[in-house]
Interface confidence: low
């Protein structure tokens, strides 16, 4: 950066090189150039010469004043006009930063995604600080009182191999930057309670012709957890409101869920699961679309949105298409 240049003098910032956004700051430049009594001292911000708020303090020093400085980063340097020198002479440079102290981290959450081998801890960091902010995640065993600390700049994956101090832990997060430090509340966890089963995926749908046509949704998960509770939500794509069906699930075989739906309507389905009785859910699965056939005895087979016509089948419509991925499920 600008701070690596060879200096013929000194540049400094008051109150500090990193300061709170919106503060008034002063940048001082002091020349120490051999055989030069500077006629003039110039300041540059990001390569552009500053014209205002410059005060000459003495023969070798000048001050640049900024009111309500709002830029997160800026590169400053100053130069001198020396007699008998055609060009300005570089004195020194400095990178400056403005930002905010961290907020208190909240919503600390730790989960173990099945098969990951890690405990993943996340939190709400609060407002953007604009400056380098580090987080220390503290994990303390409630059984052995052993404490581990992990330094990160966002979330943290902690190997479950490292959690040898029993199953109960306290987790809290400290946020720190040049402008301050804050600490979250402590979260108490039990390792058995924070496992999220591996993702449930809807693989296909079919509508079967009967007196009352019925749609079967096929869905599956790689989970080895025995007691899993799942929710499937569905709605017509034109609707705002979801219908939700709940299931107690055994994933030793592909799940088949039956729905009695209106004919000739495009529906969207999503599924999510949790270990029964536990706190954390999977995110909603990818959006899965299925259009029910018309009630007339024409028969359509639909797969990945390509239509083909058949006759004499009992299956009226098949879909195996995920058109988009949206783990938040904010649609409609």
């Amino acid at each position: 950066g600008i701070t690596n240049i060879n200096c013929s003098g000194h540049i400094w910032v008051e109150p500090a090189t990193i300061f709170k956004m919106g503060m008034n700051i002063s940048i001082y430049c002091q020349a120490a150039i051999k055989n030069c009594q500077p006629r003039k001292l110039h300041f540059y911000k990001n390569g552009i010469k500053e014209r205002f708020q410059i005060t000459r303090i003495n023969k070798t020093t000048a001050r640049l004043w900024y009111k309500n400085f709002l830029e997160p980063h800026a590169s400053m340097y100053c130069t001198a006009e020396c007699p008998k020198h055609f060009q300005e002479t570089l004195i020194c440079g400095k990178d400056i930063s403005s930002g905010y102290p961290p907020d208190i981290p909240d919503e600390v959450t730790c989960v173990i995604y099945e098969y990951s081998g890690n405990m993943t801890c996340t939190w709400n960091a609060g407002k953007l600080t604009y400056i380098d902010t580090k987080y220390v995640v503290h994990v303390k065993s409630l059984e052995t009182e052993e404490e581990q600390q992990y330094l990160t700049s966002s979330y943290i994956n902690i190997s479950t191999d490292s959690l040898q101090g029993g199953k109960k832990y306290l987790v809290w997060v400290q946020a720190a930057n040049a402008l301050g430090m804050e600490e979250s509340k402590q979260l108490q966890i039990h390792l058995d309670d924070i496992v999220i089963p591996s993702a449930a995926v809807i693989s296909r749908a079919e509508t079967i012709n009967a007196t009352v046509p019925k749609t079967i949704i096929y869905w599956d998960s790689q989970t080895t957890i025995e007691k899993v509770s799942c929710e499937m939500r569905y709605k017509a794509t034109t609707n705002q409101t979801w219908n939700v069906k709940e299931f107690d699930t055994n994933f030793t075989y592909v799940q088949q869920s039956e729905f009695y739906l209106e004919p000739n309507i495009k529906y969207v389905f999503q599924v999510r699961c949790q270990e029964t009785g536990k706190r954390y859910w999977q995110p909603w699965s990818s959006l899965f679309f299925h259009k029910t056939p018309e009630t007339v005895p024409q028969v359509t087979s639909k797969a990945f949105q390509h239509d083909t016509w058949n006759s004499g089948l009992t299956v009226a419509s098949i879909s195996t298409g995920h058109l988009t991925s949206d783990n938040r499920g904010d649609i409609g």
Epitope: V254, G321, L323, T324
Partner: antibody, heavy 121, light 107 residues
């Protein structure tokens, strides 16, 4: 380390059946779905589908429904791709590839070395 | 199906040069994209997943980024072993789909 080792090259007559194997090692086989990918000579990659290695449930892409079958031999940590009634357009290199990243899908992260299957005239 | 439009189809570049490849998704894929490298001997390796996360063991000269529906793979300074075919793969929606590929050749 994680490895997917596929069976050797095959030369097949039209109408014959070919079965390619993919032996996994270095991880728990039933924890990850297995994908199959086709690459015709001089062409790009085409996803054929995947098999759930825990339940054995296969999912096929449209172009691979009918003559193609995915299967498993869990005790041997091996996945299979069978092509029935082999056709000229099936001449290609076939890759097995391990899925990853539950509950967030991160696609495919480990690949077999590929098995070349050629039609003999 | 989600179409992945990959460009350019081929690219000649010199050692040490910086190059970028792009894939455009025809539908929203929410960052569910990886970049793959296929060497001349046919072996395939994943470089990037989740649009911008570098796989372990992959040199830091490779990076991935996203701008809307455009996804890019950048190699900051080409080395001899980087001359290969590159593919993007979207895994947001079934069927998973690949870009048509970019052949990166030595100039």
């Amino acid at each position: 380390q994680i490895q997917l080792v596929q069976s050797g090259p095959e030369l097949k007559k039209p109408g014959e059946t070919v079965k390619i194997s993919c032996k996994a090692s270095g991880y728990t086989f039933t924890n990850y779905g297995m994908n199959w990918v086709k690459q015709a000579p001089g062409k790009g990659l085409k996803w054929m589908g995947w098999i759930n290695t825990y339940t054995g449930a296969p999912t096929y892409a449209d172009d691979f429904k009918g003559r193609f079958a995915f299967s498993l031999e869990t005790s041997a940590s091996t996945a299979y791709l069978q092509i029935n009634n082999f056709k000229n357009e099936d001449t290609a290199t076939y890759f097995c590839a391990r899925g990853n990243g539950y509950p967030y899908y991160y696609g495919i992260n480990y690949w077999g070395q590929g098995t070349s299957v050629t039609v003999s005239s | 199906d989600v179409q992945m439009i990959q460009s350019p189809s081929s690219l000649s570049a010199s050692l040490g040069e910086r190059v970028s490849l792009t894939c455009r998704a025809s539908q929203e894929i929410s960052g569910n994209l990886s970049w793959l490298q296929q060497k001349p001997d046919g072996t395939i390796k994943r470089l990037i997943y989740a649009a911008s996360t570098l796989d372990s063991g992959v040199p830091k000269r490779f990076s991935g980024s996203r701008s809307g529906s455009d996804y890019s793979l950048t190699i900051s300074s080409l080395e001899s072993e980087d001359f290969a075919d590159y593919y993007c793969l979207q895994y947001a929606s079934y069927p998973w789909t690949f870009g048509a590929g970019t052949r990166l050749e030595i100039k």
